[in-house]
């Protein structure tokens, strides 16, 4: 947002919530009152758009112009015209002004001469008041260019070629007010420049490319109120009082500059300095005394800079501030008592922030503070005198739940119920089964025991949001650094690998019978076990690593309140981030990319065996169900990991990533496949249809059996279990024949094609 | 500590340009401007004129326009002044001096000593 | 241009004894700013001219307290209260509100009686 639509913006907002209601009402710490009447609501109530008191009080005053907007007006009500394509509203229509060149328009003693390719500044009559030369194609201003406009007060020079001004460029323009030279290429302004400038007021000097001021600089400013040198490419402010030459100073914006540190004399004479905003540039240091003069100072802005360390007494003399943004700094840790001094606080903005020391103690002795701003909701608890406190969610948890979403709330145990349930099934099916592949069985119940994993995890998580229901700040930065998040969270990780390496397992071992089929060596019990163990050993490994270096890791598990570290956010320990990459963007990628390319490869082998085959219309037939049930395993995969490859890429690239995301893909993508997985590897086969059909048959049969009071006796069911979505047809289930789908590569192509129908 | 160093005296014929030079060290060279005056024997002093080496701008006594052509040279920190087609009039000691604002001189060289004889 | 007339031409002192330089300048030195912009040199024999008072009254560093100027409009002085052999010289004042050119008066010399 440039400097003008800030101005802009807060013109018309300004004054906009002034009202305040309720100052007698007396409430509870965390409680709020509702204007003038008797209620109270707590601090998560306020300020969240919705009209909690009934009289549409704990919704006033939420805006937050504390800062210069409140004296905006005095100064700086008609900012805005600097942006406006016309700046003038000149009383009388018809033009006053003597000589006024062809292309230009002029109104009272007005002149516009916008976007009119003047290459130098025009001639005309001494009386002009106003002149505007904006986006022309002025290069230098020369000596004397505006010596006879004794009259003018505002010069408008934005968006031009200027880049060389002389020393006696501006003289003679003894009652101008405003001069706006923003958008050029200056990258030296000449001590004396503005030495008969005595009545300007605003000087505004934004997108030039200027690399050192000094004091004499501004020579001459001495009515100077507002200074404004936005991104521009200054490295350091002089170690000489800035303002000597403008002692009436009120207003100074440096934002977006490369200034590395701020030293103790430069701001020496500016007392009356009001607004100082130092966002966007490179300062790593500041000194105790930096600020001590500026006790008028009402707005310090320092945010976004390389600051790692607060001085303890550095805001001491600040008595007057109102409003203060760290913002986006990398301070490694706020002194107990940083903010002690600055009792006429009312707003404060730590976002990105990590407070590792965190506690009430800091903010207590901030009284009038209305506003706070955090990195975490989670840190709201820890100011709760603070009727605004910002964000009041990350997108995953709200102040009130950990689970923000009604939906999710809701569908955290719909899933959870669905995956446990499903997995549970087709363990608990296992005795009623006699299988002829114990070991496919193995891996079936391995898969089914990570995939249950996943759906204990959504109930601890919907426990814990049931749990924390109305009250989850309160316990949220100690949820996320407990115990418990870090385990359930790496439950989580482990269910999520040894799922995907199970899955790819199979999946290679099914390629390498069908792609291979004269290659292929049936695996026997000890290789089969040997992989299960390994991969059941991975997974712990690469859930539990994370717990075994906090100093490496940090919280790695605890970012959100769903303890799953999806993406990675700007202050994780870069080893966090590499980990979380290399498990997203190296494990699982990497067997997403196998499954598809195995799954594919089958499908094309078999549908290459099929063209040889001599029942056409069968052949398609059977082929389409194979491609429909291989589509459904990839589509499923694709549908879980897809999204979640593109969220962590995309954090990556540093793309800010909602955290809604995270709480969206936790309870509806990741949980896809572990809920899926029996339905497509074992519900949805034909031995389980048939088998459950059998054992609809016999219950049938024994129902009439006992109703003629006849014993009946349930033949023995013999499930040649063959690997997901692959059945035998009835004609080729003979035991000592296929024990092992890799046998298959003893049958004819056409027959390879009927088994999987 | 801030030092103007001009060279000793310079003797040149009628009509042939000479270009005197004035090295500055101590201070920030492209920060201030160097003004040229010239001072004859037993007189006054006469400002010539003043240069700024950020941009070279060039504000010259309108009596001196066709004489004298100041140049700088950032690398070396060195302000230079050419004049044009000297004649006996233009024997004189030339000092550079530098401002910051174009007000005073606050450092003086020694001076050079110009001598035009043939 | 502006001219700067001073008196006396030349200035007889004894040392110890207060020495008084005028100037006077063809039109006010008076800036639109408000700043008075007159300026006061030293020239020692075969010396470069040296800063000695700046802006009618200010003291350039290390000039000693006995120097002072005073003035107003087109009327200045400067004054050496104790006058010492070191302060032999041509004083020159200079005017640098209307500019270019910088202007400078005669000079004035001072020496011992």
């Known amino acids: 947002m440039t400097s003008g639509s800030v101005f802009f913006y807060i013109l018309i907002f300004g004054k906009y919530f002034s009202h305040g209601g309720g100052q007698d009402v007396k409430c509870s710490l965390g409680y709020f009152p509702c204007g003038n009447i008797t209620k109270c609501l707590p601090q998560l109530l306020h300020c969240n758009g919705v009209d909690d008191c009934g009289n549409q009080a704990d919704e006033d005053n939420c805006g937050d112009n504390n800062g210069w907007s409140l004296q905006f007006d005095k100064y700086f009500a008609s900012y805005y015209k600097m942006t406006s394509q016309y700046p003038f509203e000149a009383e009388t229509p018809e033009c006053l002004v003597g000589s006024v060149p062809v292309q230009c328009l002029c109104q009272g003693l007005e002149l516009d001469c916008d976007e009119t390719n003047l290459r130098a500044v025009p001639s005309v009559s001494s009386n002009v008041t106003a002149m505007s030369l904006q986006w022309n194609l002025i290069r230098k201003l020369p000596p004397d260019c505006f010596k006879n406009y004794h009259d003018l007060q505002k010069l408008y020079l934005q968006n031009n070629k200027i880049t060389s001004i002389s020393i006696y460029a501006f003289r003679g323009l003894n009652s101008l007010t405003k001069l706006y030279l923003s958008h050029n290429r200056i990258t030296f302004l000449k001590p004396g420049v503005f030495e008969d400038l005595h009545r300007l007021e605003w000087l505004i000097i934004e997108d030039n490319h200027l690399s050192r001021i000094s004091p004499p600089t501004f020579y001459g400013l001495n009515s100077l109120i507002l200074l404004v040198l936005m991104n521009n490419v200054l490295t350091r402010l002089p170690d000489k009082p800035l303002c000597q030459h403008m002692p009436r100073l009120h207003w100074l914006d440096l934002e977006g500059n490369h200034i590395h540190n701020l030293r103790n004399l430069t701001f020496i004479s500016c007392s009356n300095l009001t607004v100082l905003v130092m966002r966007k540039n490179k300062i790593n240091h500041l000194n105790e005394n930096t600020f001590a003069p500026l006790q008028k100072l009402d707005e310090l802005d320092l945010g976004s800079n390389k600051i790692e360390n607060l001085p303890p007494l550095i805001f001491k003399d600040l008595k007057e501030l109102s409003q203060l943004n760290l913002s986006y700094n990398p301070i490694q840790k706020i002194q107990a008592n940083q903010f002690d001094y600055l009792v006429k606080l009312k707003s404060l903005s730590l976002e990105g922030i990590e407070i590792s020391n965190i506690q009430q103690r800091m903010f207590r002795p901030l009284m009038n503070l209305s506003h706070i701003y955090f990195k975490k909701f989670q840190y709201c608890g820890y100011a709760p005198h603070v009727r605004s406190c910002k964000p009041n969610t990350d997108g995953i948890s709200s102040l009130e739940n950990l689970l923000a979403s009604i939906i999710q709330r809701v569908f955290v145990w719909v899933v959870s119920a669905v995956t446990c349930f499903g997995n549970i099934f087709v363990i608990c099916m296992r005795p009623y089964i006699r299988s002829e592949n114990k070991l496919y069985a193995m891996s079936i119940i391995s898969l089914c025991c990570a995939d249950c994993l996943m759906g204990i995890y959504l109930f601890v998580i919907g426990g814990f949001d049931l749990k924390f229901r109305g009250e989850y700040n309160k316990h949220a930065q100690l949820w996320m650094e407990s115990t418990h998040c870090q385990l359930v969270g790496s439950l989580a990780i482990l269910s999520t690998e040894v799922s995907v390496l199970l899955l790819t397992f199979l999946t290679l071992e099914k390629y390498i019978c069908i792609v291979y089929p004269f290659r292929c060596v049936r695996p026997g019990k000890c290789r089969t076990i040997t992989v299960l163990i390994l991969i059941w050993i991975t997974g712990f490994i690469v859930a539990f690593i994370p717990l075994s270096n906090k100093e490496f890791f940090k919280n790695y598990y605890g970012t959100n309140g769903v303890c799953f570290p999806l993406h990675s956010e700007d202050t994780e320990s870069i080893g966090a981030q590499i980990y979380s990459v290399a498990i997203f963007l190296g494990i699982n990628l990497a067997a997403f990319i196998i499954i598809v390319f195995s799954y594919g490869s089958m499908f094309y082998s078999v549908h290459q065996s099929a063209i040889t085959a001599t029942e056409i219309r069968n052949q398609v037939k059977k082929e389409m169900i194979l491609a429909k049930r291989f589509f459904f395993i990839v589509f499923t995969d694709a549908l879980c990991w897809i999204p979640i490859f593109v969220v962590k890429f995309l954090s990556l690239l540093q793309v800010e990533i909602p955290g809604t995301i995270t709480s969206w893909v936790v309870i509806f993508i990741l949980p896809i496949n572990s809920a899926l997985n029996p339905i497509l590897y074992t519900l949805t086969t034909r031995p389980f249809k048939e088998m459950i059909h059998r054992f609809w048959y016999n219950y049938r049969q024994r129902k009439s059996m006992d109703s003629k009071g006849q014993k009946t006796y349930a033949p023995s069911f013999i499930w040649v279990e063959m690997w997901p979505l692959q059945e035998m047809p009835p004609e080729l289930m003979k035991p000592d024949l296929f024990t092992y789908p890799c046998e298959m590569s003893l049958i004819s192509q056409s027959t390879r094609l009927n088994s999987y129908s | 500590q801030v030092q103007l160093q001009q060279p000793g005296p310079e003797l040149v014929r009628p009509g042939a340009s000479v270009t005197l030079s004035c090295k500055a060290s101590?201070?920030?060279?492209?920060?201030?401007?160097m003004n040229w005056v010239k001072q004859r024997p037993g007189q006054g002093l006469e400002w010539i004129g003043m240069?700024?080496?950020?941009?070279?701008?060039?504000i010259l006594n309108q009596k001196f326009k066709d004489k004298a052509t100041l140049t700088v040279d950032k690398s070396s920190s060195t302000a230079s002044m050419q004049l044009s087609s000297p004649t006996s009039e233009d024997s004189a000691v030339y000092y550079c001096?530098?401002?910051?604002?174009?007000?005073?001189?606050?450092?003086w060289g020694q001076g050079t000593t110009l001598t035009v004889s043939s | 241009d502006v001219v700067m007339t001073q008196a006396p031409l030349s200035l007889p002192v004894s040392l110890g004894d207060q020495a008084s330089i005028s100037c006077r300048s063809s039109?006010?030195?008076?800036?639109?700013?408000?700043?008075?912009?007159l300026h006061w040199y030293l020239q020692k024999p075969g010396q470069s001219p040296k800063l000695l008072i700046y802006?009618?009254?200010n003291r350039f560093s290390g000039v000693p307290d006995r120097f002072s100027g005073s003035g107003s409009g087109t009327d200045f002085t400067l004054k050496i209260s104790r006058v010492e052999a070191e302060d032999l010289g041509v004083y020159f004042c200079?005017?640098?509100?209307?500019?270019?050119?910088?202007?400078f008066g005669s000079g004035t010399k001072l020496e011992i009686k």
């Open positions: 039109q006010s030195l008076v800036h639109s700013n408000g700043n008075t912009y």
């Open positions: 101590g201070y920030s060279f492209t920060s201030y401007w």
């Open positions: 001096a530098r401002c910051l604002l174009p007000h005073y001189f606050d450092y």
């Open positions: 200079s005017q640098s509100t209307h500019v270019p050119p910088f202007t």
């Open positions: 802006k009618v009254s």
């Open positions: 240069i700024h080496p950020s941009d070279s701008e060039t």
